[in-house]
């Protein structure tokens, strides 16, 4: 099958191979597309409502003044000519909207160095079939999961015209000491080939850093973070800074499920508690910070350590913040 | 053996303020935290909020943001929340549970039923 | 608000496996939910049993397993009991609030 693009809303003329210049002519058009159940037959004389869709012209071409989503399918003329030889044309017909100029909605001024910040939202309306939005940083391809850049994609469908809107939210993470006025844009790659991309105007929002921060402290009680079975272990996350952040805690690597405190305490050690923990120390005006990590570990009875923890208690075997 | 009483059924006015609370035993009362639970008649269970009885901090369900309020008597051994502008909504009963670092709600109040009524 | 989803009834023999599940209308369940699931018992009798997906609470019998199967969280009775007759609720951690499945009523005949 020859592939036939033709643009939505434009008029297509499809040829009928073999088929003599004028009637009286031996051909048929049988139609499959999304407008029909099956395949439809149409034939010179026509005639009746298909003529608004699509019609055989005096010369044996398939006519279609205006075509739209439903007419993407299967279009096979079969012709004799006055000899009656018989040439078969077979089409598969795909249709295109090219959307509008993307734009980038909701830009950030301002982001901040070594955390995650939203660059902005990418918007495409209109497109068919749907395509693809892509991320460029100084005119180079962003790749998402790569290097902090994250991206968020959401397709919607206008329910009566069947066009296509995209969305694309980019998510940084700009490294310290890097470009200050870093240059985004976004652009949009049509679903069928030989079309060109459409870009959107860039962006340059300005990198801010923030001051180094004191390291976060996370001291361990016992030392060494080894304890017998039942006992307890404290960990206190120290902060220098004022006014004091606010602490959550981790569990290889998880954020465990409390409020925020400076203090985990962990009494009654079992086996479900080893792990590496660490505290996550969030200022107001600084992104998150993280403390080292601890490995919390069990002496089995008759093992040396380098400490044991304080055995008893109630025999509410959990850990929690104090 | 640890155990969580809670204090009575309370019948009560719309607009109106009450405060349930749970006394902690059988255990460290600051080594672990206290959330509550609400559970209307015939429906499931929604999640209130915790509170760390060690440093005050708590966590609240979106929905109870402004209608409960967490605190914690560390002389006493008890966790309290108060809930305000009391409507029929709030009629349900509430639970205490005690909270592990890793959310295990291993043990359970005996439950306070809270009628709002006229 | 998340949506956690729950089997609303099932019913089992003594002696029987039973599996119950709890989905997240989010994605998949991981281990960062903290899965926790909680038995009722007449009379608003309420013990926890599992913690951290697959952490067993203090004296609860090894019949009694935490899981993740798939995209959901699911607790397994290996040999049911009649005295396991109860709703049982899971509860998922998102962030910085828990929400509580529907529960499941589990009858063993």
């Known amino acids: 099958a020859q592939n036939i693009t033709a643009r939505i809303g434009e008029p297509l003329v499809l040829k009928c191979k073999g088929a003599p210049k004028k009637p009286p002519q031996r051909l048929e058009w049988k139609l499959n597309t999304g407008r029909t159940e099956a395949w439809k037959v149409l034939s010179p004389q026509g005639g009746g409502p298909w003529d608004s869709v699509a019609r055989v012209l005096p010369n044996g071409s398939l006519f279609l003044p205006a075509v739209g989503i439903q007419d993407e399918g299967i279009f096979r003329c079969q012709a004799m000519n006055r000899n009656g030889k018989e040439t078969k044309s077979n089409y598969r017909v795909r249709v295109y909207q090219i959307p509008g100029k993307p734009e980038i909605v909701d830009s950030a001024s301002e982001l901040t160095a070594g955390v995650p910040n939203k660059v902005g939202t990418c918007v495409s309306e209109g497109s068919y079939p749907a395509g693809t939005l892509s991320w460029h940083l100084d005119g180079k391809p962003l790749v998402p999961n790569e290097k902090g850049v994250s991206v968020k994609e959401q397709t919607r469908r206008h329910p009566e015209t069947g066009l296509f809107t995209l969305q694309s939210e980019l998510m940084v993470t700009p490294a310290r000491g890097g470009d200050p006025r870093p240059t985004f844009s976004c652009s949009f790659s049509p679903g069928l080939p030989r079309h060109r991309a459409l870009r959107t105007a860039p962006i340059q929002p300005r990198v801010w850093e923030p001051v180094p921060l004191e390291e976060v402290q996370l001291v361990v009680e016992p030392e060494g973070g080894a304890v017998a079975p039942g006992g307890t272990v404290t960990l206190t996350c120290e902060v220098p800074a004022q006014p004091s952040p606010q602490i959550h805690w981790m569990k290889d690597g998880v954020p465990l499920p409390l409020p925020p405190s400076p203090v985990l305490i962990l009494p009654e050690i079992g086996p479900q508690d080893q792990g590496t923990y660490s505290c996550v120390a969030t200022h107001s005006s600084h992104g998150p910070q993280e403390s080292r990590a601890v490995s919390i570990s069990i002496i089995e009875p008759g093992e040396e350590g380098p400490t044991a923890g304080s055995v008893g208690g109630s025999g509410l075997g959990t850990l929690a913040l104090a | 053996q640890v155990q969580l009483q809670q204090s009575g059924a309370e019948l009560v006015r719309p607009g109106t303020s009450v405060k349930v609370s749970c006394k902690a035993s059988?255990?460290?009362?600051?080594?672990?935290?206290i959330e509550w639970v609400k559970q209307r008649p015939g429906q499931g269970l929604e999640w209130i909020g915790v509170?760390?009885?060690?440093?005050?901090?708590?966590n609240y369900s979106e929905r109870f943001k402004g209608k409960a309020t967490l605190t914690a008597d560390k002389s006493s051994s008890t966790a309290y929340m108060q809930l305000s502008s009391l409507t029929s909504d709030d009629s349900a009963v509430y639970f205490c549970?005690?909270?592990?670092?890793?959310?295990?709600?291993?043990?359970w109040g005996q439950g306070t039923s809270v009628t709002v009524s006229s | 608000q998340a949506v956690v989803t729950q089997e609303s009834a099932l019913t089992t023999s003594p002696g029987e496996t039973v599996t119950l599940t709890c989905r997240s209308s989010?994605?998949?369940?991981?281990?960062?939910?903290?899965a926790n699931w909680v038995q009722e018992k007449p009379d608003h009798l309420f013990t926890g049993l599992i913690r951290?997906?697959?952490n067993r609470a203090p004296g609860v019998p090894a019949r009694f397993s935490g899981s993740l199967i798939g995209d959901k969280a699911a607790l397994t009775i290996t040999g049911a009991q009649t005295e396991d007759e109860a709703i049982y609720f899971c509860?998922?951690?998102?962030?910085?609030?828990?929400?509580f499945g529907g529960g499941t009523k589990l009858t063993v005949l």
């Open positions: 549970a005690s909270y592990r670092y890793d959310g295990g709600m291993d043990y």
């Open positions: 059988g255990y460290a009362f600051t080594n672990y935290l």
């Open positions: 509170i760390n009885p060690g440093s005050g901090g708590t």
């Open positions: 989010t994605g998949a369940v991981t281990t960062s939910n903290y």
């Open positions: 951290g997906t697959n």
């Open positions: 509860a998922l951690w998102y962030s910085n609030h828990w929400v």
